[in-house]
């Protein structure tokens, strides 16, 4: 009876996500068969989050709307380890929008999910950010410095990275 009600709950939760994510990849968390964590297929997972690399070229605002439709946001990078995971799936000759912007052009950077901007946990390329008109952040590869962040114009189409919390069922 307990297993039956648990299964019913899982099914109803899966239905919530079915509209945007028809297929989920789930793994058992720890030793308890009761707890599963899932990411939409073919998203990748790291710690408690799922990531999707969008290869369509769109403006920053449209990229964020696109992530939002999937129940996600443009990626918020909280640690060096997280960035190191993300870059494994990126192409060196491309740039990808992050969920970081400065809409007022006053160098008050803000993350899309309201995570406080911490200057100590940023990975700007040297000399960046460098232009008050460039109000959105990308991650890209520079041969001299490997992967890092750069400020660019928000209306310039780029690829992007979406991030969402894992789905627990």
């Amino acid at each position: 009876n307990f297993m039956y009600s648990k299964t019913v709950k899982r099914l109803s939760k899966l239905r919530e996500y079915q509209q945007y994510h028809p297929s989920l990849t789930c793994v058992m968390e720890g030793k308890d068969i009761e707890d599963w964590s899932c990411c939409p297929t073919p998203w990748t997972s790291f710690q408690s989050s799922c990531y999707f690399i969008s290869t369509g070229m769109q403006s920053w605002t449209k990229s964020q709307k696109n992530c939002s439709v999937m129940g996600a946001d443009l990626v918020v990078i909280n640690t060096r380890e997280e960035q190191d995971f993300i870059i494994q799936n990126l192409k060196r000759n491309s740039s990808y929008f992050l969920g970081l912007s400065d809409p007022g052009g006053r160098r008050h950077w803000q993350w899309v999910d309201q995570t406080p901007y911490n200057e100590n946990v940023t990975f700007w390329h040297s000399g960046e950010p460098n232009n008050l008109d460039e109000r959105c952040a990308i991650i890209n590869f520079r041969s001299s410095e490997e992967w890092g962040w750069n400020d660019i114009h928000c209306h310039v189409p780029q690829k992007s990275i979406c991030k969402m919390k894992k789905i627990y069922i």
């Epitope: 605002t61 809409p103 007022g104 232009n131 008109d133 109000r135 189409p157």
Partner: antibody
Framework: EVQLVESGGGLVKPGGSLRLSCAAS????????MSWVRQAPGKGLEWVAT????????YYPDSVKGRFTISRDNAKNSLYLQMNSLRAEDTAVYYC??????????????WGQGTTVTVSS | DIVLTQSPASLAVSPGQRATITCRAS??????????MHWYQQKPGQPPKLLIY???NLESGVPARFSGSGSGTDFTLTINPVEAEDTANYYC?????????FGGGTKVEIK
């Protein structure tokens, strides 16, 4: 007072080339993105090219891509548009416009008087 | 590309009356309360002149009889009351993404 003065327009045969110039004054030219916008006789406005303040970014519509090149010389406070392989449909008044950024986009807050380009055999 | 459709294509208004021009975008040009739609006036033989930026902000030096409103895909420029010197073409422009695009224009004539 902000001023933008275009020059370099004229009559050119199809397949020919022209270089338009825009002399800027009254503001710190190097701090602003700039664009060229054109208007065919009796028609509406059509954006032609954009260059960022730092010269790091240029952008063109498909209609002129590969034929037109926007550039700037911040030391001379000047904007340029090199137009090659000109076609009859490029006939228009070409305006130089300053971009002012607002939030995630921008608008054109100052425009020059325009220079006329006529492509005809 | 985002397509902007202006209506009407032309209108004739008596002095002192209200003129209303609409601009419809093929997709939203708004984001988190910011509306990236702008309006320009162009008189015969002159370059365009900025009237309204970000849907509703009056550019410095523009008379208060000009106003803008709207969000998402639908925007309006209102001139109230219209004066004889307002005879011109009016254009909307979006800048939320490249390429920047303009509406086809609305010709306003004073009766």
């Amino acid at each position: 007072e902000v001023q933008l003065v275009e020059s370099g327009g004229g009559l050119v045969k199809p397949g020919g080339s022209l270089r338009l110039s825009c002399a800027a004054s009254g503001f710190t030219f190097s701090s602003y993105g700039m664009s060229w916008v054109r208007q065919a006789p009796g028609k509406g406005l059509e954006w032609v090219a954009t260059i960022s303040s730092g010269d790091s970014y240029t952008y063109y519509p498909d209609s002129v891509k590969g034929r037109f090149t926007i550039s700037r010389d911040n030391a001379k406070n000047s904007l340029y548009l090199q137009m090659n392989s000109l076609r009859a449909e490029d006939t228009a008044v070409y305006y130089c416009a300053r971009q002012l950024y607002y939030s995630y986009g921008y608008y054109f807050d100052y425009w020059g008087q325009g220079t006329t380009v006529t492509v005809s055999s | 590309d985002i397509v902007l459709t202006q209506s009407p294509a032309s209108l004739a208004v008596s002095p002192g009356q209200r003129a209303t021009i609409t601009c419809r975008a093929s997709e939203s040009v708004s984001f988190h309360g910011t509306h990236l739609m702008h309006w320009y006036q162009q008189k015969p033989g002159q370059p365009p002149k900025l009237l309204i930026y970000a849907a509703s902000n009056l550019e410095s030096g523009v008379p208060a009889r000009f106003s803008g409103s709207g969000s998402g895909t639908d925007f309006t420029l209102t001139i109230n009351p219209v004066e004889a010197e307002d005879t011109a073409n009016y254009y909307c422009q979006q800048s939320i993404e490249d390429p920047p695009t303009f509406g086809g224009g609305t010709k306003v004539e004073i009766k």
